[in-house]
Amino acid sequence: SIPWNLERITPPRYRADEYQPPDGGSLVEVYLLDTSIQSDHREIEGRVMVTDFENVPEEDGTRFHRQASKCDSHGTHLAGVVSGRDAGVAKGASMRSLRVLNCQGKGTVSGTLIGLEFIRKSQLVQPVGPLVVLLPLAGGYSRVLNAACQRLARAGVVLVTAAGNFRDDACLYSPASAPEVITVGATNAQDQPVTLGTLGTNFGRCVDLFAPGEDIIGASSDCSTCFVSQSGTSQAAAHVAGIAAMMLSAEPELTLAELRQRLIHFSAKDVINEAWFPEDQRVLTPNLVAALPPSTHGAGWQLFCRTVWSAHSGPTRMATAVARCAPDEELLSCSSFSRSGKRRGERMEAQGGKLVCRAHNAFGGEGVYAIARCCLLPQANCSVHTAPPAEASMGTRVHCHQQGHVLTGCSSHWEVEDLGTHKPPVLRPRGQPNQCVGHREASIHASCCHAPGLECKVKEHGIPAPQEQVTVACEEGWTLTGCSALPGTSHVLGAYAVDNTCVVRSRDVSTTGSTSEGAVTAVAICCRSRHLAQASQELQ
């Protein structure tokens, strides 16, 4: 039988007694920045080329004895997980290894930077097909390392990194915290977060997804036929690098943004027990376990979206938080969330020629998060329409008035500190799906987009009694672009998208009376692109 981790990432239609996905990543080159490796292990011999790059610090301790098999252990195992002929994910991928970690697994920021520069120069001198760079290492936050990763990513290279094994917020580490890098946490055979001694996988908003990372069988540097089990986010990242290699081999023109969206889209959803994570990190941590797509082609017709959380604003009265989409993505909606419920909403605004999502803290609040819904929408023309606070008691309204523009998201933000505490709910008139409605004291922002074949609809789910959470999901074939709460309820903590479901969170019901104040309505905007569907049918 195949190792559990390969079975886990394999869609059911491929599952037989063997792991034989349709394309093994043969068009892709994977660079591994790690320890030295045993390149003559039969699992990877002929698949891994050891470059002459080496930049490592001296080993600590006077009694340290260099033992080749120990020096090669980490890198050999990871090379096997990525492309090993027996227990590898992308059995067709070729690899190049750069030594940036010493025999104790330690490296330096400068060594990694020079390694990344070596790759960039190699790419310029001899351009090949798609490149994946695997960084199975984590150190303290480094602005300079993150910037180097950004430069390489913008040159068209896919970077995959380990979230880190510190049972901590991945945003505190580099390169895990670099937004352009695909950051991977580790799960076990039960789809639970990996515990490593007293520590374990990192988590939080800087993690893009999880992948198998416990008891992973792979090449051992002990001998040419030896295999060993290793655990950690490095192993998890190696799985995603392998999956990425296979996706890129099937569709070599995929951009980083498209690849990331596909990795998220094809992941197993909501299988991780979030109780393992600290309570304040649960909402921020993606509940996704990486998997191969069920088919290497035919994904092009879908409208792909993902949720991007900002850093926490901090508690000061005028604090704000900003969430940004990747350069190739469109910001289709913006929402906000505060654990205390004290916030002043959110707005979409232009920054450096691109829309960002900004959330505003309120007086006495412990801070807010901005939540961006970032989508792949080719040939899109999106703009924000704003209505200032209205005088009328019916509340503020704004709609998409331009011909061919559809509503993809609604945001509202207000200057008063305690909006709506003693006000009845404002109900949106039926039959007007293309408009956003809000409190009369609030500014309302509508995200209006024009793209070939784009159509959207509004879906609501209201609960009259108080509930800590109200959800509404888009049906099959539609993608959630916007998520908000219907105005009028004072106890809403915020709204955010989880996969294709809009979640509206409220204060603990025990603190809320069961008056009409308790009513909560979640509003989802669901979109699809007929243009993308037709394009993919023509290609097949």
Epitope: D17, E18, Q20, D40, R42, E43, E45, G46, S73, R85, D86, A87, K91, G92, S220, D222, C223, S224, T225, C226, F227, V228, S229
Partner: antibody, heavy 119, light 113 residues
């Protein structure tokens, strides 16, 4: 059942070429390595090299490198051992055997192919 | 290369008696990563291909009679036939399968006294 079936005995003259075969059945041929082992008359076993039919990766014993070529056709689950120019010293029984990453010992052997090289 | 040396070269034992074959490797075939010895024992009867008896130095292959047992670790290994039967007359080989090239011992011929 799992088996490796080898081609029949061969009698050749020095300088001639030869290709013998080993056909696997009853298992996933591309998941296992196939090794070739030589046994000269009245002597012990010598490992010659192996092939992984999944990607045609080969590894040779340095003593046999350049003397023989190992290949495979995964579409017909068959591995081959070939000589471009036989010598009298190539007279021997040749066995194929399989092994797996999780079981790197030879659990199944072919029945053997006797190659006789004589002028 | 790892050199495998068997002793004795031949062995004559009475039916029902114990037969012991030794095998020494020129370097350890025990690996710390999985704590396994990469050593196997094979039996070859005249006119037949070798047959796997023992792997990982001490694990008996399914279908092999329990009179066959393997022991040892690191560089020194033993194959024991606890009660020799007539059908056990054969040549026995040890093999290391950890490193290329894979190597066999020279063989030990077991006969009935």
């Amino acid at each position: 059942q799992v088996q490796l079936v080898q081609s029949g005995a061969e009698v050749k003259k020095p300088g001639e070429s030869l290709k013998i075969s080993c056909k696997g059945s009853g298992y996933s041929f591309t998941d296992y390595y196939i090794s070739w082992v030589r046994q000269m008359p009245g002597k012990g076993l010598e490992w010659m090299g192996l092939i992984y039919p999944g990607d045609s990766y080969t590894h040779y014993n340095p003593n046999f490198q350049g003397q023989v070529t190992i290949s495979a056709d995964k579409s017909i689950s068959t591995a081959y051992l070939q000589w471009s120019s036989l010598k009298a010293s190539d007279t021997a029984m040749y066995y194929c055997a399989r092994d797996h990453w999780s079981k790197p010992y030879f659990d199944v052997w072919g029945q053997g192919t006797l190659v006789t090289v004589s002028s | 290369d790892i050199v495998m040396t068997q002793s004795p070269d031949s062995l004559a034992v009475s039916l029902g008696e114990r037969a012991t074959i030794n095998c020494r490797s020129s370097q350890s075939v025990l690996y710390s990563s999985n704590n396994k010895n990469y050593l196997a024992w094979y039996q070859q009867k005249p006119g037949q291909p070798p047959k796997l008896l023992i792997y990982w130095a001490s694990t008996r292959e399914s279908g092999v009679p329990d009179r066959f047992s393997g022991s040892g670790s690191g560089t020194d290994f033993t194959l024991t036939i606890s009660s020799l039967q007539a059908e056990d007359v054969a040549v026995y080989y040890c093999q290391q399968y950890s490193s290329f090239p894979i190597t066999f011992g020279q063989g030990t011929k077991v006969e009935i006294k």
